[in-house]
């Protein structure tokens, strides 16, 4: 009889995670008698995967019944493959003995595991930023194999180019992770904007995975403040309005000061949303002119989203209101409408973007 050969016909086999892998092995002779064993790797540290003779291998099934007459097919099927199963598998023939003696090995079959990347998770900055500032978004996906992967960033459907991507580890591994950081310049129209991280991989059959983040979590749009006086009413009361516009998020506290003393404090709640996602709020203050001998300095103080307060002041000229009605010409608006939050006294320089 010819000398026994152990034949592993496939050099490599690729299997999707969760599926079964069939590793083929045939012997060319029934001689010598002795069992087959399957190992992963070579040398003293090799891992026993299946032994025909003894052991418990719950995930491994011989393809052919080992008790079958004339059996020379020693192929095995490994169920529920995970990336940890990747490696080179050797079918090894032993000669019967006490103990059995290793006789001949097959050339080996490399098992590679195609594992899908996890759903990309996009995380934004820890603190909000204002328009014209650049914020970073990070996208992470794990557990994929093989290593080749494509990641793209989009903002409102437009592909971004300012990002940096790393796939780890750099060397051979059973599975890989990707981490990408994109830099996005905010605009005041970004409350409704969305960034998308798109991951394409061979296991996804052309249907990429997407992770999203809303810029509403990252942006702060500071309010515009405008204080105006309505016509004096017949009862010598002046209606002064503080219009707070185009702000986001909604968290806002408004305080009215009369000559520096707190008159009223209000919290914004349940405001209707503008088309662009921002909010507007109007607050009124009635000032009884006849109760004042001197001009009244009214200040609308707005604290938005935990930022330092923004003030807008307005002077109600008592002398200009003997008893006439319907005029606001004597009112003097001493506030500013600058977006850098200078108050009219120029005491604070709050450049919080």
């Amino acid at each position: 009889e010819e000398e026994l050969q152990v034949i592993q016909p496939e050099k490599s086999v690729s299997v999707a995670a969760g599926e079964s892998a069939t590793l083929n092995c045939t012997a060319t002779s029934l001689i010598p008698v002795g069992p087959i064993q399957w190992f992963r790797g070579v040398g003293p540290g090799r891992e026993l995967i299946y032994s025909q003779k003894e052991g418990h291998f719950p995930r491994v099934t011989p393809v052919s019944d080992p008790t079958k007459r004339n059996n020379m097919d020693f192929s095995i099927r490994i169920s529920n493959i995970t990336p940890a199963d990747a490696g080179t598998y050797y079918c090894v023939k032993f000669r019967k003995g006490s103990p059995d003696v290793e006789l001949k090995s097959g050339a080996g079959t490399e098992l590679s595991v195609r594992a899908k990347p996890s759903a990309p998770v996009v995380s934004g900055p820890a603190v909000r930023a204002t328009a014209e500032h650049t914020v970073s978004f990070t996208c992470e996906s794990h557990g994929f194999s093989p290593r080749d992967i494509t990641l793209k960033w989009f903002k409102n459907g437009n592909e971004l180019s300012d990002f940096q991507t790393n796939v780890d580890p750099a060397g051979k591994s059973v599975s890989y992770s990707i981490r990408s950081t994109a830099r996005v310049v905010l605009t005041r129209r970004d409350v409704h904007s969305q960034v998308i991280c798109e991951v394409a991989h061979v296991t996804l059959q052309g249907d990429p995975l997407r992770g999203t983040a809303n810029l509403s979590e990252a942006i702060r749009v500071p309010p515009f403040l405008e204080v105006t006086q309505q016509s004096m009413r017949a009862d010598n009361q002046v209606n002064v309005t503080c219009q707070v516009t185009k702000f986001y998020p909604q968290r806002l506290q408004l305080t009215w000061l009369e000559n520096g003393n707190v008159s009223r404090t209000e919290m914004a709640s349940a405001l209707p949303e503008n088309k662009d996602g921002t909010y507007n709020w109007t607050s009124w203050l009635l000032v009884n002119v006849s109760a004042h001998r001197d001009d009244v300095k009214l200040t609308c103080q707005v604290e938005h989203d935990g930022q330092p307060a923004v003030n807008k002041s307005f002077s109600v000229k008592v002398s200009a209101h003997p008893k006439e009605q319907g005029s606001n010409t004597a009112a003097e608006n001493t506030g500013t409408n600058e977006r850098d939050y200078k108050d009219d006294d120029d005491k604070h320089h709050h450049h919080h973007h």
Epitope: L30, I31, V33, S51, K53, T67, R69, N70, K96
Partner: antibody
């Protein structure tokens, strides 16, 4: 290493039944055939039957087909051979033997169980 | 059924001499490229021991003075130089179909 440990000697009356056990160790019980062979005093070897413990497939020598039954208990890796309607010429040493190469041969043997049939 | 006939029934050979035991099958035991013949040695009070499988292959641990030959229907077990511990009964067995044994050959020292 492979070991086959058989039950102890039995004395039976004609017409009775005997059930001999063979406990296997040192290998995966379900991966190899178990054969049963007997040897009457001063006589040669006589093959009785064989069983595949993985699925209980059996092959019998026609001479014993109606009187012998092979079974296995995979939870204890034990094979059994029951012989019914015993006669005095069934007095023999009964061996179990494991077929290591699926060649329908007998690679490893138990020590044997002496069954004596006498009135 | 295949019937195996061994010859001689008994044999006496001097120590160091060659011993030859024959086994003839009533029909060919060759199948799938193999001769399905096995040889066993049984010493008094012991179970048989496999010596040769598939006509010509020594089992593990069997001294190389034992050899098997033959094809088709005629087979031979040869002990090239008889040792005292070789005194035993030798059986051939076929398994082209289901196993059957030859009647045995008793080997003694002359």
């Amino acid at each position: 290493q492979v070991q086959l440990v058989q039950s102890g000697a039995e004395v039976k009356k004609p017409g009775a039944s005997v059930k001999v056990s063979c406990k296997a160790s040192g290998y995966t019980f379900t991966n190899y055939w178990i054969n049963w062979v007997r040897q009457a005093p001063g006589q040669g070897l006589e093959w009785i039957a064989m069983i595949d413990p993985s699925d209980s497939e059996t092959h019998y020598n026609q001479i014993f087909k109606d009187r012998a039954t092979l079974t296995t208990d995979t939870s204890t890796s034990t094979a059994y051979m029951e012989l019914r309607s015993l006669r005095s010429d069934d007095t023999a040493v009964y061996y179990c033997a494991m077929d290591y190469g699926s060649l329908y041969a007998m690679d490893y043997w138990g020590r044997g169980t002496l069954v004596t049939v006498s009135s | 059924d295949i019937v195996l006939t061994q010859s001689p029934d008994s044999l006496a050979v001097s120590l160091g001499e060659r011993a030859t035991i024959n086994c003839r099958a009533s029909q060919s035991v060759r199948s799938s490229g193999y001769n399905w013949i096995f040889w066993y040695q049984q010493k008094p009070g012991q179970p048989p021991k496999l010596l040769i499988y598939l006509a010509s292959n020594r089992d593990s641990g069997v001294p190389d003075r034992f050899s098997g030959s033959g094809s088709g229907t005629d087979f031979t077990l040869t002990i090239s130089s008889l040792q005292a511990e070789d005194v035993a009964v030798y059986y051939c067995q076929e398994s082209r179909e289901l196993p059957t044994f030859g009647q045995g050959t008793k080997l003694e020292i002359k």
